[in-house]
């Protein structure tokens, strides 16, 4: 309740997160008439990426383009990219939708289609759908520890969300353990009314709101966080217009002294931690 006699001050905050969990992934890669089943273990270093600010990212799905090398090759025959003669291909042209620089030649992509040859990382990335169900759908059971230090400089008051009495094996629950700062990712989605399994396919952005409503008067002192969760990306975006959340990164290696890379299109959840609130004191 608003205490008009108090001097109010907005919170100053710093956040640090630690994600834990292991995922076992079975992926099917079909090419050239062979479906290769690969089994791999993903740990924190494989699925989390350091982000700026109060955010962390958990990869839930991916599409790989393996064995790419810098050379000449036909570009992927996306809509409008096919050609029938060299006239359609412009030497030196860099189409923003393309993955390379055109050489001016129209070459066979496969038995039935021809596309402009490009200088690029080859073979160029195919436009593949994100696997369904998501490869790291078990990320639902990962946990994140959120450390939140806050400060009210005008009141010379500092505290944090983790208390010395807290049990390191607790898990946040709105009713049973609302002060635990270890959150199961699936629970965050459930609290926000979202389906983790579904969002994991294309990715998305989830907000973790930490609200501090602090009464710093000694006779009725109270300063503990309240956690709430809501989805921040537009889940109703037309499917054809860049749904979800994804980015690309590459792993580079050498094979027979030739530099190669595996391109990975990573889909996942970006968690934004939004800290707000006030401290009031007479």
């Amino acid at each position: 309740s608003d205490k008009l006699y108090q001097r109010k001050e907005p919170v100053i905050s710093s956040v640090h997160t630690k994600v834990k969990g292991i995922a076992e992934v079975t992926e099917n890669v079909t090419e050239g008439g062979v479906t290769k089943l690969g089994h791999s273990i993903f740990d924190t270093a494989d699925y989390t990426f350091p982000l700026q600010g109060n955010s962390f990212f958990v990869m839930t799905n991916y599409v790989k383009s393996e064995g790419q090398v810098q050379t000449l090759c036909p570009e992927y025959p996306r809509r409008g990219a096919q050609c029938s003669s060299d006239r359609r291909c412009k030497k030196g042209w860099m189409d923003p939708q393309s993955k390379g620089i055109q050489t001016g030649r129209c070459v066979p992509y496969d038995k039935t289609r021809k596309t402009c040859e490009v200088s690029a990382w080859c073979p160029t990335e195919e436009e593949k759908e994100a696997p369904r169900p998501a490869l790291l759908r078990s990320a639902e059971n990962f946990t994140v520890l959120i450390k939140n230090n806050i400060h009210f400089p005008g009141h010379n008051y500092t505290t944090r969300n983790i208390l010395p009495t807290m049990n390191g094996s607790c898990t946040f629950h709105k009713t049973w353990d609302p002060q635990c700062s270890i959150f199961r990712l699936g629970d965050i989605f459930q609290e926000a009314g979202e389906n983790f399994t579904e969002v994991a396919v294309q990715g998305g952005i989830m907000g973790i709101e930490i609200y501090w409503d602090c009464n710093l008067d000694s006779w009725s002192h109270h300063c503990r966080p309240r956690y709430s969760f809501r989805r921040l990306d537009d889940k109703n975006t037309d499917e054809s217009f860049v749904p979800g959340y994804n980015f690309r990164y590459a792993k580079y290696y050498k094979e027979n002294n030739v530099e190669k890379r595996t391109l990975i299109k990573a889909f996942g959840i970006r968690f934004d931690i939004l800290v707000f609130g006030t401290g009031g004191k007479f």
Epitope: G33, V34, K36, L37
Partner: nanobody, 128 residues
Framework: EVQLVESGGGLVQTGGSLRLSCAAS????????IAWFRQAPGKEREGVSI???????FYADSVKDRFSITADGAKTTVFLQMNSLKPGDTAIYYC??????????????????????WGQGAQVTVSS
């Protein structure tokens, strides 16, 4: 009509080598992956090696580093070079065109994509 004809089988001593050939007609190796399967008496049929239609090779754990699968330049014949043969390699070897699954060193037919096209087989006997 798709046809696969194996040749090159025979009797060989332990540690010896053999080269099996599979002549394909009625399709090209761009259309299908080609695999070698084998069946020993009283045992289940097992996949030995695959040459995918884009030129990638796969081997069962039991033959890795001993067997090698290749194709000729015209992509009409597939070869299985078998070195350091053991009595356990004794079987009828079949050449198969189709779709396959490679799972942690085990090769099987992708039955969801059909039963494939099979040759008549070539007998390989390794004596000790």
């Amino acid at each position: 009509e798709v046809q696969l004809v194996e040749s090159g089988g025979g009797l060989v001593q332990t540690g010896g080598s053999l080269r099996l050939s599979c002549a394909a007609s009625g399709f090209t190796l761009d259309d299908y992956a080609i695999a070698w399967f084998r069946q020993a008496p009283g045992k289940e049929r097992e996949g030995v090696s695959i040459l995918s239609s884009i030129g990638k090779t796969f081997y069962a754990d039991s033959v890795k580093d001993r067997f090698s699968i290749t194709a000729d330049g015209a992509k009409t014949t597939v070869f299985l070079q078998m070195n350091s043969l053991k009595p356990g390699d004794t079987a009828i070897y079949y050449c198969v065109a189709g779709h396959f699954v490679y799972n942690d060193g085990a090769i099987s037919l992708n039955t969801a994509r059909g039963s494939g096209f099979w040759g008549q087989g070539a007998q390989v006997t390794v004596s000790s």
